[in-house]
C-alpha cells in the first residue's frame, strides 16, 4: 500500500495505490483511491507512467480527456466513471502487454487539494494448473499442465504422505513456447505415484504462485487448484 500526500499549495489530499500484476493479453486493474469530493466536475484524475512521454489516462469535468494520451495506451484505458465521485480513481487496462510493466503515478486534483501516489505494476502470464492421472503411461503417473506462464516459472512437486520429499529425480518438466512467442505452456510429469496420497504441483514465478492438488484413492480422484499473485503491496 502506498499512501501519497499532495505537496504543493496549502491543501493536500490522501491518495492510496496498491501494487499489482497484470496477466498478458487479459485486462488488468491499477488500483487507486482518494478522499472523495462532492462535485464530480471538480475532480481531475491523471495517470502517468515513468519514462512514457504522453499521459496514460486523464479524466476531468466528468469525462475522459485523452487528447494527449500516449500512443501505447490508445483505446486500452478506462476509469470507473460512476465510482469517481466516491473516491475510486482505479484504471482498467485492456489487453495487458509485457511493456505495460513499470512505475505508474495516480495524480488527483479536487476542490480540497492535490495528491498523488506511485504504483508498481508487474506484467507476466500466469494460469491455473490442472493435475490429471496419465493413463497412457506404463506406471502410475501424474501430469500437471498450465497453459500460460511468463517469465519461466519453477515447478515443484510435493506430497502429503512424504512431506519434505524431493521429487526432482522422479519428475520431468518441460516448457513449450505458445504461438505468440512470449508465454509458455508448462507440463510437468511425476512418476512412481502411489495411491491414497495427495500430490501438489506448485508453479511459481516472481509474479504469481499457483498450486494444483490431486488426491488419488482406489475409489475416486479429487482435484483442487488455486492461484495467488505475489507482492500486492499498497502505497
Amino acid at each position: 500500500l502506498i499512501i501519497g500526500f499532495g505537496i504543493s499549495g496549502r491543501h493536500s489530499i490522501t491518495v492510496t495505490t496498491v501494487a499489482s500484476a497484470g496477466n498478458i493479453g487479459e485486462d488488468g486493474i491499477l488500483s487507486c483511491t482518494f478522499e472523495p469530493d462532492i462535485k464530480l466536475s471538480d475532480i481531475v484524475i491523471q495517470w502517468l507512467k515513468e519514462g512514457v512521454l504522453g499521459l496514460v489516462h486523464e479524466f476531468k469535468e466528468g469525462k475522459d480527456e485523452l487528447s494527449e494520451q500516449d500512443e501505447m495506451f490508445r483505446g486500452r484505458t478506462a476509469v470507473f466513471a460512476d465510482q469517481v465521485i466516491v473516491g475510486n480513481a482505479s484504471l482498467r487496462l485492456k489487453n495487458v502487454q509485457l511493456t505495460d510493466a513499470g512505475t505508474y503515478k495516480c495524480y488527483i486534483i479536487t476542490s480540497k487539494g492535490k495528491g498523488n501516489a506511485n504504483l508498481e505494476y508487474k506484467t507476466g502470464a500466469f494460469s491455473m494448473p490442472e493435475v490429471n492421472v496419465d493413463y497412457n503411461a506404463s506406471s502410475e503417473t501424474l501430469r500437471c499442465e498450465a497453459p500460460r506462464w511468463f517469465p519461466q516459472p519453477t515447478v515443484v512437486w510435493a506430497s502429503q504422505v512424504d512431506q519434505g520429499a524431493n521429487f526432482s529425480e522422479v519428475s520431468n518438466t518441460s516448457f513449450e513456447l505458445n504461438s505468440e512467442n512470449v508465454t509458455m505452456k508448462v507440463v510437468s510429469v511425476l512418476y512412481n505415484v502411489t495411491i491414497n496420497n495427495t500430490y501438489s504441483c506448485m508453479i511459481e514465478n516472481d509474479i504469481a504462485k499457483a498450486t494444483g492438488d490431486i488426491k488419488v484413492t482406489e475409489s475416486e480422484i479429487k482435484r483442487r487448484s488455486h492461484l495467488q499473485l505475489l507482492n500486492s503491496k499498497a502505497s
Partner: antibody, heavy 120, light 113 residues
C-alpha cells in the same frame, strides 16, 4: 528544422548483423519517440517498433522481436537499429521516423532511408 | 493485428480531375476518449521516404495543399484529391495509427493517363 539523417547503404552476408543509425537534429531529441519501418522493394511498409529516446525503452512488433534491436545514444542524439541473423528477406529500405507530437504518432519526419542488401 | 485494405491498387488519372481512393480497417480506429479516428494518409514518390498528408482521418498536415481531403470514421476512410496535379503522382498509403503494431495498407498507385 527537424532532420533525421540515416547511415548509408549496407551490403551484408546472410547470417550477419547490421547496425543502422539515425541522427536527429533541429529539436529536443529526448522529447519525441523514434519509430522504425521496413519497406521491401516495390512493397508496402511494415512497422518494426519504436524507441523512447528519454530512457531507451523499446516496443517491438512481435514479428521483429529478436530480429531488430532498437537503442539510443542521447549524447549524440542518435537512434540505432541493429538487425541480426540476416536472411535475404531482410533486404529492404529501412526508415526511421519521428512522431509529430510528444505523446506519439503520426510519423511526421522521416529519414532518407537506408538500403540493406543481404547477399552471399 | 489490424489489417488495412486499400482500393483500387492503381488509378489512371488526368491532371485536373477529381480522385478518390478508399481504405478499410479490420477493426474500428475510432477512439471515444479523444473523439479521434487514428487513421493516417501518406504519399511516397520513387526513391523518397513517405510524406505525411493527413492524420486523425481528416486533419491536413501543415503545408499540404487543400486539394487533399481525408474523410471517414470507424473502419471506412477516403482520401480525395479535388483536382489532381502532376506532382501528386505517387503511391498513397493509409496507416492504422490506433494500436500497436501499427500497420499500413498495400497502397494505391496514382499514374498518369
Amino acid at each position: 528544422e527537424v532532420q533525421l539523417q540515416q547511415s548509408g547503404p549496407d551490403l551484408v552476408k546472410p547470417g550477419a548483423s547490421v547496425k543502422i543509425s539515425c541522427k536527429a537534429s533541429g529539436y529536443s531529441f529526448t522529447g519525441y519517440y523514434i519509430h522504425w519501418m521496413k519497406q521491401s522493394h516495390g512493397k508496402s511498409l511494415e512497422w518494426i517498433g519504436r524507441v523512447n529516446p528519454n530512457n531507451g525503452d523499446p516496443i517491438y512488433n512481435q514479428k521483429f522481436r529478436g530480429k531488430a534491436i532498437l537503442t539510443v545514444d542521447q549524447s549524440s542524439n542518435t537512434a540505432y537499429m541493429e538487425l541480426r541473423s540476416l536472411t535475404s528477406e531482410a533486404s529492404a529500405v529501412y526508415y526511421c521516423a519521428r512522431v509529430l507530437f510528444y505523446y506519439g504518432s503520426p510519423f511526421a519526419y522521416w529519414g532518407q532511408g537506408t538500403l540493406v542488401t543481404v547477399s552471399a | 493485428d489490424i489489417v488495412m485494405t486499400q482500393s483500387p491498387s492503381s488509378l489512371i488519372v488526368t491532371a485536373g480531375e477529381k480522385v478518390t481512393m478508399s481504405c478499410r480497417s479490420s477493426q474500428s480506429l475510432f477512439d471515444s476518449g479523444s473523439q479521434r479516428n487514428y487513421l493516417t494518409w501518406f504519399h511516397q514518390k520513387p526513391g523518397r521516404p513517405p510524406k505525411l498528408l493527413i492524420y486523425w482521418a481528416s486533419t491536413r498536415e501543415s503545408g499540404v495543399p487543400d486539394r487533399f481531403t481525408g474523410s471517414g470514421s470507424g473502419t471506412d476512410f477516403t482520401l480525395t484529391i479535388s483536382s489532381v496535379q502532376t506532382e501528386d503522382l505517387a503511391v498513397y498509403f493509409c496507416q492504422n495509427d490506433y494500436s500497436f503494431p501499427f500497420t499500413f495498407g498495400s497502397g494505391t498507385k496514382l499514374e498518369e493517363k
